[in-house]
């Protein structure tokens, strides 16, 4: 057999025995001649250096580059590969020789009284016990001890090969201290040398430090670092630590094996580094290295040592946070400190507790920010050891995209009498206030919804070509008043008004308000009618449980068939876009109402009376009249708003006050409610009567006591009452100083 790569024009050495395998008997002489084309050498089993005394290699007498190998009286141990090769090349010819020695069927290693086999306990691994045979076809079994077990080749994972040895899954013999091969020849047993079984591993899966990061201490505290190495079974570990102050007096290192669950394929080692009282010089990188000989793994962590406990705010701590309504707001408390501080949040001085809308921890989180969340938030950091406190104020500004108040009305589709002057209003609430409110318009017929046009709830008017109000050609003459600012419902609002000089044309008007965080718009249907006219008696806005009459007045010579309807709830989304369409063209959504007809010399008056008006009575009321000549129907729509009854409340408190004799006292008591409450004043629970020194103004809202006297001292009560109840506030007025004596005395 030949091995190696061919060199240029060099043939393989030729052996005198032209076989791959030669079998000879023990005690006979083995002689093989090798011829080649350049200097040759021989290699034989159990000897790589050529110092074996029994083996003789001689130059051939009959030619150059020829060597004969001779071994007289061969023994079983001479079994193996004999190789003739050219010096300095890989070119060689090999013959495998079996020396059949039935008294010694196994080839013994020259140097070993016993061998060593290394195994791992992995179920998938096999191990080869190198008990080579001097006879190729022996029946060989493997004996393991203790306890004694015998393994026989099974044609699968257990096998014996005379050139290789005995192959067996390593876990089968991992319990054993030693193994040997045994051959049976003619009922006689022959054993190989003993092999010591060494179960080894070397793999380090990982090295984990605990704590793994963010380790902070102050001078004098104890540092404990645990380093855990996870390895495969039968691994030994050397631990080594690197740390800043190597000459530490109070350093303690403890290494130990950790117990793992039985059946675990893993082993754990723990090394614990303890420094009893750290100093500043102990600050730095701590590295734990685990070494198994064939592998090293390490892990590091940084330990920070502070001179003493402290707390401070980090440079990234914000002072102003801006957000838009509905957003999630996160305000992190950025701090430097050891140990970590206790964190408490306050809003306008009141402690914040976590709930489903707000989380007050390291990060103050407001889930869905609203206007009422605007304010100053104070975060107070307290060092748990030194009790040192640091506070920082964060101003939260919540922006509101423009909201137009009138949009909340049910359906602003009032009709306007031809030729009249009308004012349209957009009341805008926005934070910051809108930087502009613009008005646009469009003719009603250009915008009336055709069936083919798609309409959505979000855009009920399919109008594309909005025109600026400066361009009022073909429309009504318009004037936009300067924006006004008003405090409405406790909020600063911007009021934009558009004055239509003469209502000549039906149109749609749109106001659009824009601020830094968004925009809002309102579309107003301005339907002009020459038809009937609606008035409300006695009030424009009744309160619930009051009575109200809707009067529809029409010229009797022009109109007939006056009828009252109420606009029903519109089925969405089909009719949403039809609001600007004259209501007369769409009677499907109208409910006919009972009414009473009166006449005078020129007009018919149809009166629809609502007794004890309720919130359900709110909505759009339609008066329909028919032209006597053309039979064309004319509609007028009026929106009725019914104010909710609200029990009296008094805004603001009366303050206790001390006044000197002869001075004046002025206090006010502002009450709200619907119906509006009556305000009364009491002194020491008796009705306060006006006289020259006691003045009540503005519906008793303001009380003035001029040139106070000692007898004006007492408990003053402001009481606001309506049919829904009373509300009251009290204050004690103290009058100081001596009463001047009068001449009468």
């Amino acid at each position: 057999a030949s091995v190696g790569l061919p060199s240029v024009s060099l043939d393989l050495p030729r052996l005198s025995i032209q076989k791959d395998i030669l079998t000879i008997k023990a005690n006979t002489t083995l002689q093989i001649t090798c011829r080649g084309q350049r200097d040759l050498d021989w290699l034989w089993p159990n000897n790589q250096s050529g110092s074996e005394q029994r083996v003789e290699v001689t130059e051939c007498s009959d030619g150059l580059f020829c060597k004969t190998l001779t071994i007289p009286k061969v023994i079983g141990n001479d079994t193996g590969a004999y190789k003739c090769f050219y010096r300095e090349t890989d070119l060689a010819s090999v013959i495998y020789v079996y020396v059949q020695d039935y008294r010694s069927p196994f080839i013994a290693s020259v140097s070993d009284q016993h061998g060593v086999v290394y195994i791992t306990e992995n179920k998938n691994k096999t191990v080869v016990i190198p008990c080579l045979g001097s006879i190729s076809n022996l029946n060989v079994s493997l004996c393991a001890r203790y306890p004694e077990k015998r393994f026989v080749p099974d044609g699968n994972r257990i096998s014996w090969d005379s050139k290789k040895g005995f192959t067996i899954p390593s876990y089968m013999i991992s319990y054993a201290g030693m193994v040997f091969c045994e051959a049976k020849i003619n009922d006689e047993s022959y054993q190989s040398i003993m092999y010591i079984v060494v179960v080894v591993g070397y793999r380090i899966y990982d090295v984990v430090l605990s704590p793994s990061h963010g380790i902070e201490l102050s001078v004098g505290e104890k540092l404990v670092l645990n380093c855990t190495a996870r390895t495969e079974l039968n691994v030994g570990i050397d631990f080594n630590w690197e740390y800043p102050s190597s000459k530490h007096q109070h350093k303690k290192l403890v290494n130990r094996d950790l117990k793992t669950q039985s059946g675990s394929e893993m082993k754990k080692f723990l090394s614990t580094l303890t420094i009893d009282g750290v100093t500043r010089s102990d600050q730095g990188l701590y590295t734990c290295a685990a070494s198994s000989g064939l592998m090293t793994k390490k892990n590091s962590t940084f330990v920070r040592v502070h001179e003493k406990p402290f707390v401070a705010f980090g440079s990234g701590m914000e002072s102003l946070v801006e957000a838009t309504v509905g957003e999630r707001v996160r305000i992190p408390a950025k701090y430097l400190g050891y140990p970590p501080p206790e964190i408490k949040w306050y809003k306008n001085g009141i402690p914040l507790e976590s709930n489903h809308t707000i989380k007050a921890g390291h990060v103050l989180t407001i889930m869905e920010v609203s206007e009422r969340d605007t304010g100053n938030y104070t975060v107070i950091l307290t060092n748990p050891i030194s009790k040192e406190k640091q506070s920082h104020v964060v101003s939260l500004v919540v922006y509101v995209p423009p909201q137009i108040g009138e949009k909340s009305l049910i359906s602003p589709v009032d009709s306007y009498q031809y030729g009249t002057t009308q004012t349209l209003t957009c009341t805008v609430y926005a934070i910051p206030p809108p930087h502009h409110i613009h008005w646009y318009w469009q003719l009603e017929e250009e915008c009336a919804n055709e069936p083919s046009q798609a309409v959505s709830v979000t855009n009920p008017y399919p109008c594309e070509e909005w025109r600026s109000v400066e361009d009022f050609q073909g429309g009504n003459k318009i004037e936009v008043n300067k924006n006004q600012f008003a405090l409405i419902e406790g909020k600063n609002k911007t009021v934009s008004t558009l004055v239509i000089q003469a209502a000549n044309v039906s149109a749609l008007y749109k106001c659009e308000a824009v601020n830094k965080v968004g925009r809002g718009e309102r579309v107003i249907s301005f339907h002009v009618t020459r038809g009937p006219e609606i008035t409300l008696q006695p009030d424009m806005q009744p309160t619930e449980q009051e009575s109200v009459s809707l009067w529809c007045t029409a010229d009797r010579s022009t109109f007939e068939n006056l009828t009252w309807y109420k606009l029903g709830p519109q089925p969405l989304p089909i009719h949403v876009g039809e609001l600007p369409t004259p209501v007369c063209k769409n009677l499907d959504t109208l409910w006919k109402l009972n009414a009473t007809m009166f006449s005078n010399s020129t007009n018919d008056i149809l009166i629809m009376e609502l007794k004890n008006a309720s919130l359900q009575d709110q909505g759009d009321y339609v008066c329909l009249a028919q032209d006597r000549k053309t039979k064309k129907r004319h509609c007028v729509v009026r929106q009725l708003t019914v104010l909710e009854r609200v029990a009296p409340t008094i805004t603001g408190n009366l303050e206790n006050q001390t006044t000197s004799i002869g001075e004046s006292i002025e206090v006010s008591c502002t009450a709200s409610g619907n119906p509006p409450p009556q305000i009364m004043w009491f002194k020491d629970n008796e009705t306060l009567v006006e006289d020259s020194g006691i003045v009540l103004k503005d519906g008793n809202r303001n009380l003035t006591i001029r040139r106070v006297r000692k007898e004006d001292e007492g408990l003053y009560t402001c009481q606001a009452c309506s049919v829904l109840g009373c509300a009251k506030v009290e204050a004690f007025f103290i009058i100081e100083g001596a009463q001047e004596k009068t001449n009468l005395e």
């Epitope: 290394y118 691994k125 390593s170 030994g236 050397d238 290295a289 090293t296 390490k298």
Partner: antibody, heavy 117, light 110 residues
Framework: QVQLVQSGGGLVKPGGSLRLSCAAS????????MNWVRQAPGKGLEWVSS????????YYADSVKGRFTISRDNAKNSLYLQMNSLRAEDTAVYYC??????????WGQGTLVTVSS | LPVLTQPASVSGSPGQSITISCTGT?????????VSWYQQHPGKAPKLIIS???NRPSGVSNRFSGSKSGNTASLTISGLQADDEADYYC??????????FGGGTKVTVL
């Protein structure tokens, strides 16, 4: 930076002895396993021996077992290979190498050992 | 001497990709994800270019990549350059607590 500087190579007769040294710098020598790898002239690399950081665990290739001894001195940041009963087939360039998560993440420059009569 | 089997030589033109295989048994390459690859220029010490089958140490070009399937590991050099001409060796741990190297592959850039 990591440096491994070798010394101790030379010519020796078959059966003779030689001691190779490897001086380490640029890393914490006492934390790492170390090994020796050799390369016969014109041939491939062959692993020779490994030693754990505190010398608790030592491994050898079968071809050198019983003849070579690996050792280290962490105080001197040095690794050694004592080679006895040298044979012609031990002729090679010997490299010391650091054992990281793999067998040789940094290598020395190599030193030639020639065994010849 | 048992070694992992590598092709004796592989060649490619500049810019091409080449792959070197390294075949062992389930006792070495197949058994562990601990195959490494080394580059050795003539007269120089080997240099680690891939560890743990496919991890590239910092400073090694991303043109070198490693993979493994069964008992065979592979090193791929993409965008071949003149400086890639060198010997390449694989190695693996074995179940016998030893380390095996491949026979080496000479890479020639045409």
């Amino acid at each position: 930076q990591v440096q491994l500087v070798q010394s101790g190579g030379g010519l020796v007769k078959p059966g003779g002895s030689l001691r190779l040294s490897c001086a380490a710098s640029g890393f914490t020598f006492s934390s790492y396993s170390m090994n020796w790898v050799r390369q016969a002239p014109g041939k491939g690399l062959e692993w020779v021996s490994s030693i754990s950081s505190s010398s608790s665990y030592i491994y050898y290739a079968d071809s050198v077992k019983g003849r070579f001894t690996i050792s280290r001195d962490n105080a001197k940041n040095s690794l050694y290979l004592q080679m006895n009963s040298l044979r012609a087939e031990d002729t090679a360039v010997y490299y010391c190498a650091r054992v990281g998560a793999t067998m040789g993440d940094y290598w020395g420059q190599g030193t030639l050992v020639t065994v010849s009569s | 001497l048992p070694v992992l089997t590598q092709p004796a030589s592989v060649s490619g033109s500049p810019g091409q990709s080449i792959t070197i295989s390294c075949t062992g048994t389930d006792s070495d390459v197949g058994g562990y994800n601990y195959v490494s690859w080394y580059q050795q220029h003539p007269g120089k010490a080997p240099k680690l270019i891939i560890s743990d089958v496919s991890n590239r140490p910092s400073g090694v070009s991303n043109r070198f990549s490693g993979s493994k399937s069964g008992n065979t590991a592979s090193l791929t050099i993409s965008g071949l350059q003149a400086d890639d001409e060198a010997d390449y060796y694989c190695n693996s741990y074995t179940v016998h607590a030893t380390v095996l190297f491949g026979g080496g592959t000479k890479v020639t850039v045409l």
